[in-house]
């Protein structure tokens, strides 16, 4: 059962993890003029990875795309590629991760199966959250750096007389739910990985080897003493009172402990 | 077509206060920052400040703060500025004025004449 | 606060001249975020209250002829009349629509002969 919650959970949590990392992406601010003393401004900017915008207190709001590619600089362009990475890492990790659900049965799929295709979506969820972590950190690294600069230089004369301020910007609300999203996901993966290490077949597939005892005729399978996994029972050695001696092969329809979780 | 209403003149004794009044019509009063602007001969144009009819957000130009108090009512679509402990130097015409593209004053009133005097 | 500088004060043309007056600021009213700049020109008959002519420096507002002209950028701004008009007779200001509070110049007052 405990399997089957932390795989679903991690499933959840990645699902609203990766829907943030999207939602960030698309944000128009990741960065945004910073107010400082000036709560109340008359043009308001701020920028996304693909736009930037300006809010004028008449309440027009207008954004321009960034139309050209090579005239961007290469830190914004490493953070688009990030979070896209991010993206469609996450994006197959879901696709995988919904064939590797428990309570979602296709065909005959075993559960090593399942195991396995919920360890690669796992991984692939953490590696998203890392992209969108390491993007959005990247990002915000820039911002500190050109805050600072824009501050030493804030005012720049012009013949003594005229002042240019220097608009200066500030992490942005994409900034914050980038940070959520990407630890959300990553968490996500992780839970997906350890639900992984409860549904993978806690025997190892031996063939069973047949011991005739005077009275009746007992299949005793080894190796099924295994260190417990903690999610379930321990599955204790398995007896299959049959008569005859069965080969593994042939004994597959009778239930595991992964049937009852 | 966009109109704001306001009262011609204004008559009041020093230390008095006095409510102004502009009704806007042929928009969305809500959608629109109201501004108000003192114009004193020899002493050109003044920003006072302005307020948002459906936030009740308001902005002062610290001049006038103390002096100029801005307030809306939505269901006359009407704004108002109260200026309080006249004196003559708030002898004036002021105005009420609709922002648009460009932070512009695209629609001003007529402007209300207050004189101060005993 | 912004300090917005017309000049010259007053001018006296006859019809048909081409004008120009300035407007200074003492901070740059260019904005980078959409690179316009954030000033405003009006012009005030006697007796009427102030009409917008031209905002964001050069766009000019819906019905005003187009022999009004907005140039300039940063801290220097310009508006040309091409072929003074009779009806042209008025105070024109400057303003400024970038930063609170919004300022305005002293004026330029504009006399036909």
């Known amino acids: 059962m405990a399997v089957t919650a932390c795989q679903g959970l991690g499933f959840v949590v990645s699902l609203i993890g990766i829907a943030g990392i999207i939602a960030a992406t698309c944000m128009d601010q990741w960065s945004t003029q910073d107010l400082y003393n000036n709560p109340v401004t008359a043009v308001f900017n701020y920028q996304g990875l693909w736009r930037s915008c300006v809010r004028e207190s008449s309440g027009f709001t207008e954004c321009r795309g960034y139309f050209t590619l090579l005239g961007l600089p290469a830190m914004l362009q490493a953070v688009r590629a990030l979070m896209i990475v991010g993206i469609v890492l996450g994006a197959i990790g879901l696709l995988v991760s919904i064939f590797a659900l428990k309570c979602i049965r296709i065909g005959s799929m075993e559960d090593s199966a399942k195991a396995n295709m919920t360890l690669t979506s796992g991984i692939m969820f953490i590696v998203s959250g890392l992209c969108a972590i390491a993007g959005v950190s990247v990002f915000a690294n820039m911002l500190v750096t050109n805050f600072w600069m824009s501050t030493a230089n804030m005012y720049t004369g012009m013949g003594g007389m005229v002042q240019t301020v220097q608009t200066r910007y500030t992490f942005g609300a994409a900034l914050f739910v980038g940070w959520v999203a990407g630890g959300l996901t990553l968490i996500g993966g992780v839970m997906m990985c350890i639900a992984c290490r409860g549904l993978a077949p806690e025997e190892t597939n031996y063939k069973a080897v047949s011991y005739h005892a005077s009275g009746h005729s007992v299949a005793y399978k080894p190796g099924g003493f295994k260190a417990s996994t903690g999610f379930g029972s321990n599955t204790k050695n398995k007896k299959i009172y049959d008569g005859g001696a069965r080969t593994e092969d042939e004994v597959q329809s009778y239930p595991s402990k992964h049937d009852y979780v | 077509q966009v109109q704001l209403q306001q009262p011609g003149t204004e008559l009041v004794k020093p230390g008095a206060s006095v409510k102004l009044s502009c009704k806007a019509s042929?928009?969305?009063?809500?959608?629109?920052?109201m501004h108000w602007v003192k114009q004193r001969p020899g002493h050109g144009l003044e920003w006072i400040g302005m307020?948002?009819?459906?936030?009740?957000?308001?902005n002062y130009n610290e001049k006038f703060r103390s002096k100029a108090t801005l307030t809306v009512d939505k269901s006359s679509s009407t704004a108002y500025m109260q200026l309080s402990s006249l004196t003559s130097e708030d002898s004036a015409v002021y105005y009420c004025?609709?922002?648009?593209?460009?932070?512009?004053?695209?629609?001003w009133g007529q402007g209300t004449s207050v004189t101060v005097s005993s | 606060d912004i300090v917005m500088t017309q000049s010259p004060s007053s001018l006296t043309v006859t019809a048909g001249e081409r004008v120009t007056m300035s407007c200074k600021s003492s901070?740059?009213?260019?904005?980078?975020?959409?690179?316009?700049?954030?000033l405003t020109w009006y012009h005030q008959k006697p007796g009427q209250p102030p009409k917008l002519l031209i905002y964001w420096a050069f766009t000019r507002e819906s019905g005003v002829p187009d022999r009004f002209t907005g140039s300039g950028s940063g801290t220097d701004f310009t508006l040309t009349i091409r072929s003074v008009q009779a009806e042209d007779l008025a105070v024109y200001y400057c303003q400024n629509d970038y930063s609170y509070p919004f300022t305005f110049g002293s004026g330029t007052k504009l006399e036909i002969k």
């Open positions: 901070q740059s009213l260019f904005n980078s975020g959409n690179q316009k700049n954030y």
């Open positions: 004025t609709r922002i648009y593209y460009g932070n512009a004053m695209d629609y």
């Open positions: 307020i948002h009819p459906n936030s009740y957000s308001t």
């Open positions: 042929g928009y969305t009063f809500t959608n629109y920052w």
